[in-house]
Amino acid sequence: KKVVLGKKGDTVELTCTASQKKSIQFHWKNSNQIKILGNQGSFLTKGPSKLNDRADSRRSLWDQGNFPLIIKNLKIEDSDTYICEVEDQKEEVQLLVFGLTANSDTHLLQGQSLTLTLESPPGSSPSVQCRSPRGKNIQGGKTLSVSQLELQDSGTWTCTVLQNQKKVEFKIDIVVLAFQKASSIVYKKEGEQVEFSFPLAFTVEKLTGSGELWWQAERASSSKSWITFDLKNKEVSVKRVTQDPKLQMGKKLPLHLTLPQALPQYAGSGNLTLALEAKTGKLHQEVNLVVMRATQLQKNLTCEVWGPTSPKLMLSLKLENKEAKVSKREKAVWVLNPEAGMWQCLLSDSGQVLLESNIKVLPTWSTPVQP
């Protein structure tokens, strides 16, 4: 008996071939001997089966001795043995219809779980193997679960159902809802304008929800809500914003915030949360602000940074085109009685400069100039 695997919702062609390459009488029945379809001369005739409106054949193939049964919009319950009667012989075809669906919406938040459920006909014992877009393989029976979805899990999951040495492939598009970056750091000199951007890692037709940026300044004992906003069909509207600092927010995606001035009291870490309509849980992106200030007071040239810096970052003071006078893994460095000239304060990571501030030291009889 020939076995054919089908997918729920798909169309399947069950073949039946006669030795004579011409149109002759044929008919298809199910295992209960109920006629599905056949021919009367060149006309297609249909029986009283439940497949009536979904069963078809191809007249053009009859002349070649092929008498297919085509079943559209397959259902699990279409799984059956179908019998083609032609030229006093019977051809049996066992059709097994499978369905694979995601337990919930196919748009899931980062960190959530994905469960894929296989619908299969009674008496079948299929195995399922799925391959994620990043090449991770998972195997299972009737259900497959993936916990802690990551951004790289977004895309087409390809699942293969195996039964009777035959296979049928399902493709399921999964969208992991997340920000492009889990965390970002902005390095700014004191007084500069700060731009925070929160690009999303997905695109959807309509995006509605609400969000908030909480800020923990390094100098503050507790965190504070800097801004709350609504998102409606990708349009951003500010609900509430603090007076200090007075943040500005872009009206369109990607989410974009502007801090007029980088000041030491603002240096710290923020957490932007976005709650999407009809989704449980929130999207998060951490943002960090590091602020640098270079000053000269009397005979002391000082460079300081505020905000979340890694212990391996190097803070240096050097006279332009010369070796660093001082270089430390600390948040403040200074030089006593600095020579006149253009001094550079550098924050660097393994030789890569992250932030730089220049200060001109004048001969001792005049006051310093900060460019």
Epitope: V12, E13, D56, R58, S60
Partner: antibody, heavy 115, light 107 residues
Framework: QVQLQQWGAGLLKPSETLSLTCAAY????????WSWIRQSPGKGLEWIGE???????NYNPSLKSRVTISADTSKNQFSLKLSSVTAADTAVYYC?????????WGQGILVTVSS | DIQMTQSPSSVSASVGDRVTITCRAS??????LAWYQQKSGKAPDLLIF???SLQSGVPSRFSGSGSGTDFTLTISSLQPEDFATYYC?????????FGQGTKLEIK
């Protein structure tokens, strides 16, 4: 809802090979046949040939010696190659889904053969 | 090959008119016939299949009849959007063949 999107070269010189591809989105590739049809002012609508998921093909005898239809089922795509083209092959070429009737069509591509 | 002949090749009519287009096959094709509508610069759209079955989404003013060699497409009350070219197609045997078309124009 099934959508068919087609692409390929629109201008050819005589004796070259016409090459077009059609991608099916939003429906079942299995169980159906996938056809190429052309339309020219002189000959009206002319069926070129078809292919199914298993790679079975049927061709119009008038073009059979020059036509190859192939399919990449992993991408739900099928292609047409027509060799040794002449000015008589200038037409709008359509891809379409068929069982007995052509129920979904591509947007069509005008292919001009000119020296 | 089965030849499909449509008549008339063009017809002028007014909104609200009843219009009939005929299609004749060079040999019997039972009811393996479809009708299509094509508007300028667009691909054809399936209207009627199996000689008389209305394709999903097609207005009920369109109807088809016939069997064997002679078939008709009837539009009971013409609407402005119905002015187009109509084709018949046989699915009885390879190669599939189409009629030469009937252009329906505004009177």
């Amino acid at each position: 809802q099934v959508q068919l999107q087609q692409w390929g070269a629109g201008l050819l010189k005589p004796s070259e090979t016409l090459s077009l591809t059609c991608a099916a989105y939003g429906g079942s590739f299995s169980g159906y046949y996938w056809s190429w049809i052309r339309q020219s002012p002189g000959k009206g609508l002319e069926w070129i040939g078809e292919i199914n998921q298993s790679g079975n093909t049927n061709y119009n005898p008038s073009l059979k010696s020059r036509v190859t239809i192939s399919a990449d089922t992993s991408k739900n795509q099928f292609s047409l190659k027509l060799s040794s083209v002449t000015a008589a092959d200038t037409a709008v070429y359509y891809c379409a889904r068929v069982l007995n009737w052509f129920d979904y069509w591509g947007q069509g591509i005008l292919v001009t053969v000119s020296s | 090959d089965i030849q499909m002949t449509q008549s008339p090749s063009s017809v002028s009519a007014s909104v609200g008119d009843r219009v009939t287009i005929t299609c004749r096959a060079s040999q019997g094709i039972s009811d393996w016939l479809a009708w299509y509508q094509q508007k300028s610069g667009k691909a054809p759209d399936l209207l009627i299949f199996a000689a008389s079955s209305l394709q999903s989404g097609v207005p009920s003013r369109f109807s088809g009849s016939g069997s064997g060699t002679d078939f008709t497409l009837t539009i009971s009350s013409l609407q402005p959007e119905d002015f187009a070219t109509y084709y018949c197609q046989q699915a009885n045997s390879f190669p599939y063949t189409f009629g030469q078309g009937t252009k329906l124009e505004i009177k």
